[in-house]
């Protein structure tokens, strides 16, 4: 029941993952890995943060957002078909078995030969906010309405329903704020 995101060969892919630090600068270690989340940490780690900074990264993988504010969304530069697969975002909240694990499926499509259509700006009407709740059973999807001024009170990936990376970029460009605490 991984949430699915898409990008085209040659584009940058965007895999959203967010949390709200308990206090500004009070960061939680996060890792991103290629492959589903294992029991501890991430498998095949591509990027890692600690309580202060990004302390490990590999080429083409970076955090474009402000990770000090909890935006730990992963950008993969210039994707190829080999980048398809499941990625794990793990937020390592201190405590007893407190980690939050999110498996995100990246699907890479061959580059379009024809010019891309005009990007949909009024995407809140076309794509109402969806929250995909993941557990051991099938994904349960519910509509939460349009995007602005949403306040989620749980750690979650942002825009789980936005399957296309460009739509996720639109979300960031729109200035919609999601507060997760």
């Amino acid at each position: 029941s991984e949430v699915e995101y898409r990008a085209e060969v040659g584009q940058n892919a965007y895999l959203p993952c967010f949390y709200t630090p308990a206090a500004p600068g009070n960061l939680v270690p996060v890792c991103w890995g290629k492959g589903a989340c294992p029991v501890f940490e991430c498998g095949n780690v591509v990027l890692r943060t600690d309580e202060r900074d990004v302390n490990y990264w590999t080429s083409r993988y970076w955090l474009n957002g402000d990770f000090r504010k909890g935006d730990v969304s992963l950008t993969i530069e210039n994707v190829t078909l080999a980048d398809s697969g499941i990625y794990c975002c793990r937020i390592q909240i201190p405590g007893i078995m407190n980690d939050e694990k999110f498996n995100l499926k990246l699907v890479i499509k061959p580059a379009k030969v024809t010019p891309a259509p005009t990007r949909q700006r009024d995407f809140t009407a076309a794509f109402p906010r969806m929250l995909t709740t993941r557990g051991h059973g099938p994904a349960e999807t519910q509509t939460l309405g349009s995007l602005p001024d949403i306040n989620l009170t749980q750690i979650s990936t942002l825009a789980n329903e936005l399957r296309d990376s460009r739509l996720a970029n639109d979300l960031r460009d729109s200035g919609a704020t999601i507060r997760i605490g």
Epitope: G33, G35, A36, P38, V39, F40, E41, C42, G43, N44, V45, V46, R48, Y56, T58, Q92, I93, P94, G95, I96, M97, N98, D99
Partner: antibody
Framework: EVQLVESGGGLVKPGGSLRLSCAAS????????MTWVRQAPGKGLEWVAS????????YYLDSLKSRFTISRDNAKNSLYLQMNSLRAEDTAVYYC????????????????WGQGTLVTVSS | DIQMTQSPSSLSASVGDRVTITCRAS??????LTWYQQKPGKSPKLLVY???TLAEGVPSRFSGSGSGTQFSLTISSLQPEDFATYYC?????????FGQGTKLEIK
């Protein structure tokens, strides 16, 4: 040379407590997840608990988390397992193990193990 | 919990034989599988991790394969020091779980 040496095992009555220790040497202890695995006499391996590098994240077998507490002291290169309200079924050899780790991997399998310490719970 | 089932439980073989031990997971664990070897009175030794990667210092006669729910450990030509008990362990789901073990004995 990597070494893990467990101590603190012994005979204890049901309902009693024990604190196991694992002294680590030959590696940078604070860089590694650490784990306790147990093995009842003549039986297979059972994961008990694990702890992350700085001790802020802990993981337990559900049935044990109310009675067992894993902790570490990186300054002393030591791992601990506090066991309370012990039962006969806790009788086992308890192994301390190091989670295999480098920056691009995950510490979900164990590359070095101690020799084990026997805990016997009996009246 | 993810159940790990090894087969056979015990196996008799001779030096030079090729043997295969299998491990089945009750659900998809991708390639998150490890194999250990344990000799009587000793602690386990890491052989293979991530289903097929040989641990440092492990002889090349050992090999691991599989993904999803079906895995195997093969010893291409048994040596006297290979007679031991072998355990698989999954590290996809909490709790970490081990197979019940396969005891490899001399025929």
């Amino acid at each position: 040379e990597v070494q893990l040496v467990e101590s603190g095992g012994g005979l204890v009555k049901p309902g009693g407590s024990l604190r196991l220790s694992c002294a680590a040497s030959g590696f940078t202890f604070s860089d590694y997840y650490m784990t306790w695995v147990r093995q009842a006499p003549g039986k297979g391996l059972e994961w008990v608990a694990s702890i992350n590098y700085d001790g802020r994240n802990t993981y337990y077998l559900d049935s044990l988390k109310s009675r067992f507490t894993i902790s570490r002291d990186n300054a002393k290169n030591s791992l601990y397992l506090q066991m309370n309200s012990l039962r006969a079924e806790d009788t086992a050899v308890y192994y301390c193990a190091r989670g295999y780790y480098y920056y691009g991997s995950s510490p979900n399998y164990f590359d070095y193990w101690g020799q084990g310490t026997l805990v016997t719970v009996s009246s | 919990d993810i159940q790990m089932t090894q087969s056979p439980s015990s196996l008799s073989a001779s030096v030079g034989d090729r043997v295969t031990i299998t491990c089945r997971a009750s659900e998809n664990i991708y390639s998150y599988l490890t194999w250990y070897q344990q000799k009587p009175g000793k602690s386990p030794k890491l052989l293979v991790y991530n289903a097929k990667t040989l641990a440092e210092g492990v002889p090349s006669r050992f090999s691991g394969s599989g993904s999803g729910t079906q895995f195997s450990l093969t010893i291409s030509s048994l040596q006297p020091e290979d007679f031991a008990t072998y355990y698989c362990q999954q590290h996809y789901g909490t709790p970490l779980t081990f197979g019940q073990g396969t005891k490899l004995e001399i025929k």
